[in-house]
């Protein structure tokens, strides 16, 4: 729901976006998940900090854990275990890479309303969870698996070969958990928690990453991470699964890695419990373009996992990488041996389909020349998936419901034509047996979140709708956005367009292209932000556009795998050709036209910049690869091949921004990077600085000291000041 | 290649003791169950004992249950056999080994070339 | 335990005859079957599992069927080098039992 627009005699209560409303989150929106518990009760931490527990069909709710316990511990997060007999409380949060981080853990015994005294966790641990049944306790600590009968009792260490930087178990090591398995944990419990698979990873022969971090002190740290960049040594993998009941009786048994996998570097990819003795494992080739799942039995009589060929299925592609950004994970029906998963179609566009004894017989669930997005649930009588098949917006996300007991089977959209205008981009939650779900509303109008029946799809109630929000905008003046798309060559370049709030077509605007450009991913999108571009549009009077170019998702293979061996060409090209459209619109002043982006975006723009078009005065690049030399292997080599000789070394060396110093010379550019970027590592930046140097080329460049490839905290204010100030002298506009 | 060798066989009295090592190569040795095999003189072959891939977990023939140990170290990627007490039924080429559960209910498929056990006075 | 009976003990053929070895089990053990090909003084190979599935790098002439507890080994054009001792060995429970084994010799 977006404001709806002033006429003109309210337009001076009108205000303007300022750039201080987007540096205080004046106008950030909230959703709301439920953390559910069953089929018809979630948990939810209210806004005065209590967790309560909500009863969908009695109506009732309570408080199962006070904000006064919560305090007591200073806790942050919270998890009840399933017998509901314990909740753990988690302090003392501090982050380590994107999604890892270590926390003090208390148990909270809910039957005396005391905290479980003798045997307490050791701190700080590295992951903590549950079993899915009970309140087994499984978790890390220095690198090492330990587990717990029950709270109280004394641990039991399952790994003993844990060291910081060199063997990781039950926790990726950074390029796991950054760009295979995006999580802070490798550890699964089986359904009814009597295995635990783990992970583990040795990183002893990675070459390690080494930078300062500054500090308060008179001497800098060396931060040294195992990191794998494009050619380089990589983890070794290996997964074992105990038995929790009996966990000193045999001991962690070793997972055989499939033969056509084994027989050269590998990786794991994701582990899918199907029953307590049933799992499934996927591998995936070095050179990404062949992945194996491995459907794995226990064999009582020989406490072993046996994975028997019948039981693997390849994946392969033969005109890019396996998968989309991952290779997609499957979602096991009630037989347990049948399965769905998400993989291309015949036509090249990714879709739903159904696997019963081999991928070659697999039957397509879904198809059209759109993609399925996701698997949320498959019950006995449905599957719930998303896509973007609705009016053929690549950028929008329906939940569809498919029925599976019935044939042929029927599809149904749950939220095509819920709130139409205001809602085009979903998620959803569901409950245990989809008994009942949330959908969660990302815009493009204000985000919301409703309840709902899973039988018959009738909205419940709403869960948050964002009102205050909506009351704060009612005096904002909003740019106006447009989703279209430009025709050229025979792709289909689609874009976002925020526009200025009173826009005149007969007026002429500066440009700013925004772009990220990363393959596999999606810029433009239906969903509600505001932002620093938006106030870009609402108070500077730019326009701003987001193009989707070669390389990005959600609309074929063709698109995808364009960018396949030879990244920074086509991903470039398309932002030019866009460019040239714009101007063609006549409403872009030519002579004001600049791009800017973070990350691979930085990369993008940088190649733009140094494209020798004309067509930019000025960018930005912020946090850039400047070679996939640098760029950790996982990513990198997926989408490039390897930097060798005999297969693609040529194009590494060709596409880095340091051999386009030259082309600065007639831009203005800023370059920007944090020094503790872990990510991206800020060699990337020195490397172009270095070569802007060496060929006397000027430019601008701000570093961010002790800062990662995020730049968070006040550096974030600072970063959007400093950029405010350079596009506004670049565009001529007065402060 | 992946090859299994044995060592260790040779002449002992009766109620002697004798320990068969199985050097393995070209696999992931760790990730596999192994068993010994023995074949006497002239006749076909009879399984002995059995150890999982973490080699937590034994198991032995009735004929030689409390005589004979199995085990193994993933470190050293090898399996041994400790033979006590020794009978002159005993006498056979003993083989080691890998079971691999890729094969649907799982199957022998990797065989050392077999080690001589003699017991006799 | 899991006996297993085979039959005949021993059989005398001559080269591109089709030779066909059968083994019972005493109880039923699904399509959990493998045969083994044995020649003096070599290990024993593994040429079929699963009652039905060729181990790749076999020749093609070695055919395996059945389930339950009757399975047959059947070599459709015996080669000279297939002169050997055969022995079927049941996988579906522990502990893993043989065959006493065929011995096929030249006629």
């Known amino acids: 729901l977006r404001p709806s627009r002033v006429h003109n005699s309210e337009e001076n209560t009108m205000r303007a976006l300022t750039l201080k409303d987007i540096l205080n989150g004046t106008f950030s929106y909230k959703t709301f998940f439920p953390n559910w518990i069953s089929g018809q009760e979630y948990l939810h931490q209210s806004a005065d900090n209590n967790i309560v527990l909500y009863n969908i069909e009695t109506g009732q709710s309570y408080t199962i854990l006070s904000n006064r316990t919560m305090k007591s511990v200073n806790a942050s997060n919270y998890g009840l275990s399933p017998d509901r007999q314990f909740v753990y409380l988690e302090s003392d949060y501090s982050k380590l890479w994107r999604y890892s981080y270590t926390a003090t853990y208390y148990i909270y015994d809910l039957s005396n309303g005391e905290f479980v005294r003798g045997n307490e966790l050791p701190r700080p641990i590295q992951y903590l969870c549950w079993s899915p049944v009970g309140s087994k306790l499984a978790y890390v600590y220095q690198n090492n698996i330990y587990l717990k009968q029950r709270p109280g009792d004394p641990p039991f260490q399952i790994t003993f070969n844990g060291r910081e930087n060199k063997i990781f178990n039950g926790i990726p090591d950074w390029v796991y958990e950054e760009e295979m398995l995006a999580t802070k944990y490798a550890l699964w419990w089986s359904p009814n928690g009597k295995f635990l698979a783990y992970a583990e990873f040795n990183d002893t022969d990675i070459p390690v990453i080494a930078y300062s971090y500054y500090g308060d002190e008179q001497y800098p740290r060396t931060i040294n991470i195992p990191y794998p960049k494009a050619g380089a040594k990589n983890p070794v993998v290996r997964i074992f699964i105990i038995d929790t009941t009996y966990p000193a009786y045999v001991g962690p048994q070793e997972v055989p890695v499939p033969a056509m996998i084994a027989s050269s570097d590998y990786y794991f990819s994701w582990l899918t419990w199907v029953t307590d003795e049933r799992v499934c494992l996927q591998w995936l080739k070095r050179v990404q373009n062949v992945s194996v799942l491995s459907i794995c039995d226990f064999r009582e009589d020989w406490q072993t996992w046996d994975c028997p060929k019948t039981q693997e299925h390849i994946e392969e592609s033969r005109t890019g990488w396996a998968g989309g950004f991952f290779v997609s994970t499957p979602v096991f029906s009630y037989d347990a041996i049948s399965y769905y998963k998400i993989f291309s179609d015949k036509d090249g566009y990714k879709h739903i389909h159904y696997i019963k004894d081999t991928v070659e017989n697999a039957i397509q669930i879904t198809s059209g020349k759109w993609e399925a997005i996701n698997i949320f649930r498959v019950t006995q009588d449905s599957l719930f998936y998303s896509s973007n098949e609705f009016e053929e917006y690549p950028g929008r996300r329906n939940i569809y419901r498919i029925s599976i007991g019935s044939y042929p089977p029927s599809k149904k959209c749950v939220t095509c034509h819920l709130r139409k205008e205001r809602c085009q981009y979903y998620t959803a939650s569901f409950s245990d047996y989809a008994k009942y779900y949330a959908l969660v509303c990302y815009g493009p109008g204000i985000p919301i979140s409703t309840l709902h029946d899973g039988r018959t799809d009738q909205e419940i109630k709403i869960l948050e709708e964002n009102k205050e929000l909506e009351n704060a905008l009612k005096n904002i003046q909003l740019p106006k956005e447009e989703i279209k798309k430009l025709e050229v060559d025979e792709i289909t370049l689609w874009y976002k367009m925020i526009l200025p709030p009173q826009f005149d077509r007969s007026k002429k605007y500066p440009l700013l292209i925004q772009v990220y450009g990363g393959p596999c991913s999606q810029s433009v999108r239906s969903v509600f932000a505001v932002n620093w571009i938006s106030y870009l549009a609402s108070k500077e009077g730019m326009v701003i556009a987001l193009v989707d170019g070669r390389g990005t998702a959600f609309q074929g293979d063709k698109l995808l795998y364009a960018v396949y061996r030879k990244l920074g060409v086509y991903e470039v090209e398309d932002q030019i050709t866009a460019v040239r459209k714009f101007i063609e619109m006549g409403f872009i002043d030519e002579k004001r036209i600049a791009i800017w982006g973070w990350s691979y975006g930085g990369y993008v723009s940088s190649l733009a910049l140094a494209s020798g078009t004309g067509l930019f005065k000025c960018g930005i690049a912020v946090a850039p690869v400047s070679s996939w030399e640098y760029y950790a292997s996982v990513y990198t080599e997926r989408f490039m091949g390897l930097p060798t000789k005999d297969d693609n070394l040529e194009h590494y060396k060709n596409s880095t921004v340091m051999a386009r110093a030259e082309y600065f010379r007639n831009v203005d550019y800023l370059l920007i990077h944090g020094t503790a970027d872990d990510n991206v590592h800020f060699q990337n930046s020195a490397q172009i600085a270095k070569a802007l140097v060496n060929a006397q080329v000027d430019f601008q460049a701000m570093w961010y000291s002790d800062q990662n490839h995020g730049l968070s905290g006040l550096s974030t204010n600072h970063l959007y000041t400093h950029m405010t100030h350079f596009l506004k002298q670049c565009f001529s506009l007065s402060d | 290649e992946v090859q299994l060798v044995e060592s260790g066989g040779g002449l002992v009295q009766p109620g002697g003791s004798l320990r068969l090592s199985c050097a393995a190569s070209?696999?992931?040795?760790?990730?596999?169950?192994m068993i010994w095999v023995r074949q006497a003189p002239g006749k076909g072959l009879e399984w002995v004992s059995a150890?999982?891939?973490?080699?937590?977990?034994?198991f032995n023939a009735d004929s030689v249950k409390g005589r004979f140990t199995m085990s193994r170290d993933n470190s050293k990627n090898t399996l041994y056999l400790q033979m006590n007490s020794l009978r002159a039924e005993d006498t056979a080429v003993y083989y080691c080994?890998?079971?691999?559960?890729?094969?649907?209910?799982?199957?022998?498929?990797?065989w050392g070339q077999g080690t001589l056990v003699t017991v006799s006075s | 335990d899991i006996q297993m009976t085979q039959s005949p003990s021993s059989l005398s053929a001559s080269v591109g005859d089709r030779v066909t070895i059968t083994c019972r089990a005493s109880?039923?053990?699904?399509?959990?079957l493998n045969w083994y090909q044995q020649k003096p003084g070599k290990a024993p190979k593994l040429l079929i599992y699963?009652?039905?599935s060729l181990q790749s790098g076999v020749p093609s002439r070695f055919s395996g069927s059945g389930s339950g507890t009757d399975f047959t080994l059947t070599i459709s054009s015996l080669q000279p080098e297939d002169f050997a001792t055969y022995y079927c060995?049941?996988?579906?429970?522990?502990?893993?039992?043989f065959g006493q084994g065929t011995k096929v010799e030249i006629k």
């Open positions: 109880q039923s053990i699904s399509s959990y």
């Open positions: 070209g696999f992931t040795f760790s990730s596999y169950a």
């Open positions: 699963a009652a039905s």
């Open positions: 060995q049941q996988s579906y429970s522990t502990p893993p039992t």
């Open positions: 080994a890998k079971r691999d559960g890729g094969y649907e209910g799982g199957a022998f498929d990797i």
């Open positions: 150890i999982s891939g973490s080699g937590g977990y034994t």
